[in-house]
Interface confidence: medium
């Protein structure tokens, strides 16, 4: 079996983990996925996904989560804005594909939030408000609450991450609903 | 306040080449998307194509499809697009506008740059 | 691709007079349509998002409505400087499109 390696990134609060996580463009493209914390001696549990099936370039927003799946490139990206230090925590990204259990996509990410100034929104001079609000209307990605802590016999490509800080906060409230927004082809 | 600034006007020969750039300055660069969209005097808008940064990989309207070159550089915060084989119905003020979402508003502009196809 | 048509091509009304301008989808674009002003000399500066959000900025005369393929954009007290062109965007799917661009005039 192969070991689950992690990805460190050390970010401040009020900042952006912009991640990436690369999939089998063939075999996965339209395929439904998520984002997962794994919390000790739990079973991961998938915070957001994309829509079933996933659709091209149009994100899913949970919260302070997005989540763009661009079949062109083979990739699911997973922003998480305005980082809280309760975000520290593993994370996973994986593809469903029932009735067979979820796929893992390497490397875990091991997500560290500190406190400090550093592109808190509202509290430097460059932060200005975002044009962008949640839609008032939503449609809604169901998506299992759990998955399996299932041993993964072949590592995919690994995720790459970006770290940023957002010039302008993104209006974000504490949503549980899982809502579709308009992202590239 | 973000803004987005481009270099300035040009004037080209038919079947030349020309790059345009969009500078971001006062923010966060990488995780948004810029597009180009051009308008031909006294004509609309029409999207080009684009590119999120981060990803490096663009995307673009078939009908410029091997014809332009968006490409963006994290390290200046710079966006570039390139057209080649130009001809005089190219000539357009061509804008670079920012996205939080790939498939999105564009909810920042640049000034425009006047590009000019004369013989 | 998603062809946008504005009506009317142009709209001549008067300071304080409602102006409403139509924009239709040659297909479902869901509510992922924007409106850009654009004015002489100048980049197009974003009004409405997502069919009905404004804008930050965007003052509240300036309203938009529809889903699907039909949308409307409404200016409920025409202002000097709103006398502009207008146009719609879909970002529902690729490529991006615009419409043809209403342009509002002083009657």
């Known amino acids: 079996a192969t070991k689950l390696t992690e990805e460190k990134y050390e970010l401040k609060e009020g900042q952006t983990l912009d991640v990436k996580c690369d999939y089998t463009l063939e075999k996965f493209a339209s395929s439904q996925k998520a984002w997962q914390i794994i919390r000790d001696g739990e079973m991961p549990k998938t915070l957001a996904c994309t829509e079933r099936p996933s659709k091209n370039s149009h994100p899913v927003q949970v919260g302070r989560i997005i989540l763009e799946d661009y079949h062109d490139h083979g990739l699911l990206r997973v922003r998480m804005v305005n980082l809280q230090v309760e975000d520290s925590g593993l994370y996973q990204c994986v593809i469903y594909q029932p009735p067979k259990e979820p796929h893992m996509l390497f490397d875990r990410i091991r997500l560290v939030v500190t406190k400090g100034f550093s592109g808190t929104p509202g509290s430097n001079e460059n932060s200005t408000q975002n044009v962008y609000k949640i839609p008032p209307t939503t449609t809604k990605a169901l998506c299992p609450l759990y998955t399996s802590p299932r041993t993964v016999t072949q590592a995919p490509p690994k995720s790459t991450a970006d770290v940023s800080t957002p010039d302008s906060e993104i209006n974000l409230t504490n949503v549980t609903d899982i809502i579709r927004v308009p992202v590239f082809n | 306040q973000v803004q987005l600034v481009q270099s300035g006007a040009e004037v080209k020969k038919p079947g030349s080449s020309v790059k345009v750039s969009c500078k971001a300055s006062?923010?966060?660069?990488?995780?948004?998307?810029i597009s180009w969209v051009r308008q031909a005097p006294g004509q609309g808008l029409e999207w080009m194509g684009g590119?999120?940064?981060?990803?490096?990989?663009?995307n673009y309207a078939q009908k410029f499809q091997g014809r332009v070159t968006i490409t963006a550089d994290e390290s200046t915060s710079t966006a570039y697009m390139e057209l080649s084989s130009l001809r005089s119905e190219d000539t357009a003020v061509y804008y670079c506008?920012?996205?939080?979402?790939?498939?999105?508003?564009?909810?920042?502009w640049g000034q425009g740059t006047m590009v000019t196809v004369s013989s | 691709e998603i062809v946008m048509t504005q009506s009317p091509a142009t709209l001549s009304l008067s300071p304080g007079e409602r102006a409403t301008l139509s924009c239709r989808a040659s297909?479902?674009?869901?509510?992922?349509l924007a409106w850009y002003q654009q004015k002489p000399g100048q980049a197009p500066r974003l009004l409405i998002y997502?069919?009905?959000n404004r804008a930050t900025g965007i003052p509240a005369r300036f309203s938009g409505s529809g889903s699907g393929t039909d949308f409307t954009l409404t200016i409920s007290s025409l202002e000097p400087e709103d006398f502009a062109v207008y146009y719609c965007?879909?970002?529902?799917?690729?490529?991006?499109?615009f419409g043809g661009g209403t342009k509002v005039e002083i009657k």
């Open positions: 506008a920012r996205h939080w979402y790939a498939l999105g508003s564009f909810d920042i």
């Open positions: 006062g923010g966060t660069f990488s995780s948004y998307a």
């Open positions: 590119i999120i940064p981060i990803f490096g990989t663009a």
């Open positions: 297909q479902s674009v869901s509510s992922y």
């Open positions: 997502d069919s009905s």
């Open positions: 965007q879909q970002h529902d799917v690729w490529p991006i499109t």
